[in-house]
């Protein structure tokens, strides 16, 4: 069964029970290349930071290549998704409880800014793929994802016919496409200038305070 | 590099049938569907149907129903199309081609015409 | 029998614009392919989905749709551009694919 974030009563700054996080965010000097806009306060390590950038990484044996070569401009995105899942300490208010045997929690229904969720998209539907989920249905016996027999790879347009049929299909609904822009302050951004701070701590204080007006709101 | 090369030109008789080939290399064979598609002289492109190489699914042509079959080899990476009852009207050029996307066919073998002439 | 439907013959003056059209039912619920075949050779595609090109294809080539009409554009034509040009499109019922009678493009 799964709890609702409310469930928590530590909805910011904290890390995910899950498979690579940390327990305890905190500064991480060295964290590589397009993970490193978390360097002030992250939930993620240097190494797995390291090792995410990898082709079919260590940490989830996850192979981006699945249907031939994936193109660049479009697996920068999934490095970024990557960064913000694994390193991100504002996620707290969209965290729920799973029954997995790989993690306890994951995030359900993030508001993704929609530039975000429409850039990947567009730099992506020329890829290709075979799944329109890929949280499940793969074939692992190898160790490693491949397409499940009879799965063809086809453009990721033809999987995901629109950006949040590719954000919110893609990952179970971790994210849900939000109808804010950019520098709201009312949705996530996965990509970021840590120069001017992490927008995303507004982000979070925003949402966990809605949460707190709307759990108090049912108990009277 | 992703080639399609498809087998030599073939003279037919009416009735007969004819079994095009098609080999495919430098992709995984079984992760992309395979159409047929002919061109009789100077006429447009004619679709015939598809082959899920990874299942041996298949999908043809009201047209060409019953008079075609489409087939597989995996080990071979070698996708088929046989056309029976041949007529000289089946005269054509005889494509196979790499589906992406329903339709949108990126690579095309060079094309094995078939002559049909009693 | 589903069909799309293209004008036989289009010519454009080397270096303008030109657009090579299909109509047709199937249109309206799904993307047009775009193939140049010149003689003798098997078809290229030069436009797939939204408005993509494949890698290869000047980016003078561009698609567009509106409707039951999908629109192939060449901006700037140059004559090694002339060529017939067939359009095609899925049929979502059966997933059968449908092609257009093609355009032969001449440019003068």
């Known amino acids: 069964t799964m709890c609702s974030a409310q469930d928590r009563t530590d909805l910011l700054n904290v890390c995910m029970d899950a498979k690579h996080h940390k327990t305890k965010p905190g500064p991480e000097d060295k964290l590589h290349d397009q993970c490193s806009p978390w360097k002030k306060n992250a939930c993620c390590t240097a190494s797995t930071s390291q090792e995410l950038h990898k082709d079919t990484s260590r940490l989830y044996n996850f192979n981006w290549d699945h249907c031939g070569k994936m193109e660049p401009a479009c697996k920068r995105h999934f490095i970024q998704d990557t960064c913000l899942y694994e390193c991100s300490p504002n996620l707290g208010p969209w965290i729920q409880q799973v029954n997995q045997s790989w993690r306890k929690e994951r995030f359900l229904d993030v508001p993704l800014c929609k530039e975000d969720c429409q850039r990947w998209w567009e730099d992506c539907h020329t890829s290709h793929t075979c799944k329109s989920n890929w949280h499940r249905g793969w074939d692992w016996t190898s160790g490693v994802n491949k397409c499940p027999a009879g799965a063809l790879c086809r453009t990721f347009e033809s999987y995901f016919p629109t950006p949040a049929a590719l954000c919110e299909g893609l990952w179970s609904h971790s994210y849900k496409v939000s109808n804010y822009s950019r520098g709201s302050g009312r949705c996530i951004q996965m990509w970021f200038d840590s120069a001017q701070g992490n927008p995303n701590e507004e982000v979070a204080r925003f949402y966990a305070a809605a949460m707190h007006v709307n759990a108090g709101e049912m108990l009277h | 590099e992703v080639q399609l090369v498809q087998s030599g030109a073939e003279v037919k008789k009416p009735g007969a049938s004819v079994k095009v080939s098609c080999k495919a290399s430098?992709?995984?064979?079984?992760?992309?569907?395979m159409h047929w598609v002919r061109q009789a002289p100077g006429q447009r492109l004619e679709w015939m149907g598809w082959i899920n190489a990874g299942n041996g699914n298949t999908k043809y042509s009201q047209k060409f129903q019953g008079r075609v079959t489409i087939t597989r080899d995996t080990s071979a990476s070698t996708a088929y199309m046989e056309l029976s009852s041949l007529r000289s009207e089946d005269t054509a050029v005889y494509y196979c081609a790499r589906d992406i996307s329903y339709g949108s066919f990126d690579y095309w073998g060079q094309g094995t015409l078939v002559t049909v002439s009693s | 029998r589903p069909e799309l439907t293209q004008d036989p013959a289009v010519s454009v003056a080397l270096g303008q614009t030109v657009r090579i059209t299909c109509q047709g039912d199937s249109l309206r619920s799904n993307y047009a392919n775009w193939y140049q075949q010149k003689p003798g050779q098997a078809p290229v595609l030069v436009i797939y989905?939204?408005?993509n090109r494949p890698s290869g294809i000047p980016d003078r080539f561009s698609g567009s749709s509106s409707g039951n009409t999908a629109s192939l554009t060449i901006t700037g034509a140059q004559a090694a551009d002339e060529a017939d040009y067939y359009c095609?499109?899925?049929?979502?019922?059966?997933?059968?694919?449908?092609f257009g009678g093609g355009t032969k493009l001449t440019v003068l």
């Open positions: 095609d499109s899925r049929v979502s019922t059966g997933n059968h694919v449908v």
């Open positions: 989905g939204q408005n």
């Open positions: 430098g992709y995984t064979f079984t992760s992309y569907a």
